[in-house]
């Protein structure tokens, strides 16, 4: 079996320029692969849509923190 995990590269080339209400968000993924032009966050909405956002923006970081807390509190 392979000794390392190979993950398909997903990149964000454009980011959303408006805030997504936190109640519409379901989860997020960090994009840090250096083969991508910029670090980014992909938010998944409750309708299943994936949206790229800029983690330098305050609302993005706040949304990530909020989702982290929700998921942590769901754990037994």
């Amino acid at each position: 079996q392979p000794d390392s995990v190979s993950i398909p590269i997903t990149c964000c080339f454009n980011v959303i320029n408006r805030k997504i209400p936190i109640q519409r968000l379901e989860s997020y993924t960090r994009i840090t692969n250096i083969q991508c032009p910029k670090e980014a966050v992909i938010f998944k909405t409750k309708r299943g849509k994936e949206v790229c956002a800029d983690p330098k923006e305050r609302w993005v970081r706040d949304s990530m923190k909020h989702l982290d807390q929700i998921f942590q509190n769901l754990k037994p």
Partner: antibody, heavy 117, light 107 residues
Framework: QVQLVQSGAEVKKPGSSVKVSCKAS????????MHWVRQAPGQGLEWIGR????????KFDPKFQGRATITADTSTSTAYMELSSLRSEDTAVYYC??????????WGQGTTVTVSS | DIQMTQSPSSLSASVGDRVTITCKAT??????LAWYQQKPGKAPKLLIS???SLETGVPSRFSGSGSGKDYTLTISSLQPEDFATYYC?????????FGGGTKVEIK
């Protein structure tokens, strides 16, 4: 291929200042944060602070606030960290690293700063 | 500031051993934990972020687990190149803080 290349070793007198540079290639520093972390001989890692090169905004560990200055020149893709009022306890290897999210996936090779009278 | 307590500070192990390093935060850090490996004279290397996410190219014998305040790095079968010092780091809240390190030595 991302590379962070730092300036060479420095020997400084107590009370003086040191300025360390970190030149990035393979990435646009405007798209990330540039952090500075230090490691005293035989000790652990200590975060100093970071800059958003896109706008110059900085954040520091309160321990270094007022004594450390972090700047960036986006035209040369270079970040700088200056530490003033040096004392012997500042003898350490100083690293630059990149990362928006607060963890550090690419690091410079380190710059040794020795403070000695 | 959030303090990170890492244990043990050092351990001796043999090639093939299963090694576990723990990291405890003074408050809930919501999985915002990274693990690094550092070899003498070298910069740290990121192994894991988000408590469990293995960086690209990091061998699958490394794994991370935990939640809340308590986190673990496991090396399932220690290899010769794994003898190094390991650090945890929280990135929930600035100032970002590191554990004191765990030196993994050859028995």
């Amino acid at each position: 291929q991302v590379q962070l290349v730092q300036s060479g070793a420095e020997v400084k007198k107590p009370g003086s200042s040191v300025k360390v540079s970190c030149k990035a290639s393979g990435l646009n520093i405007k798209d990330t944060y540039m952090h500075w972390v230090r490691q005293a001989p035989g000790q652990g890692l200590e975060w100093i602070g970071r800059i958003d090169p896109a706008n110059g905004n900085t954040k520091f560990d309160p321990k270094f606030q007022g004594r450390a200055t972090i700047t960036a020149d986006t035209s040369t893709s270079t970040a700088y960290m200056e530490l003033s009022s040096l004392r012997s306890e500042d003898t350490a290897v100083y690293y630059c690293a990149r990362g928006v999210f607060g963890f550090f996936d690419y690091w410079g090779q380190g710059t040794t700063v020795t403070v000695s009278s | 500031d959030i303090q990170m307590t890492q244990s043990p500070s050092s351990l001796s192990a043999s090639v093939g051993d299963r090694v576990t390093i723990t990291c405890k935060a003074t408050e809930d850090i919501y999985n915002r934990l990274a693990w690094y490996q550092q070899k003498p004279g070298k910069a740290p290397k990121l192994l894991i972020s988000g408590a469990t996410s293995l960086e690209t190219g990091v061998p699958s014998r490394f794994s991370g687990s935990g939640s809340g305040k308590d986190y673990t790095l496991t090396i399932s079968s220690l290899q010769p190149e794994d003898f190094a010092t390991y650090y945890c780091q929280q990135f929930w809240s600035a100032p970002y803080t590191f554990g004191g390190g765990t030196k993994v030595e050859i028995k």
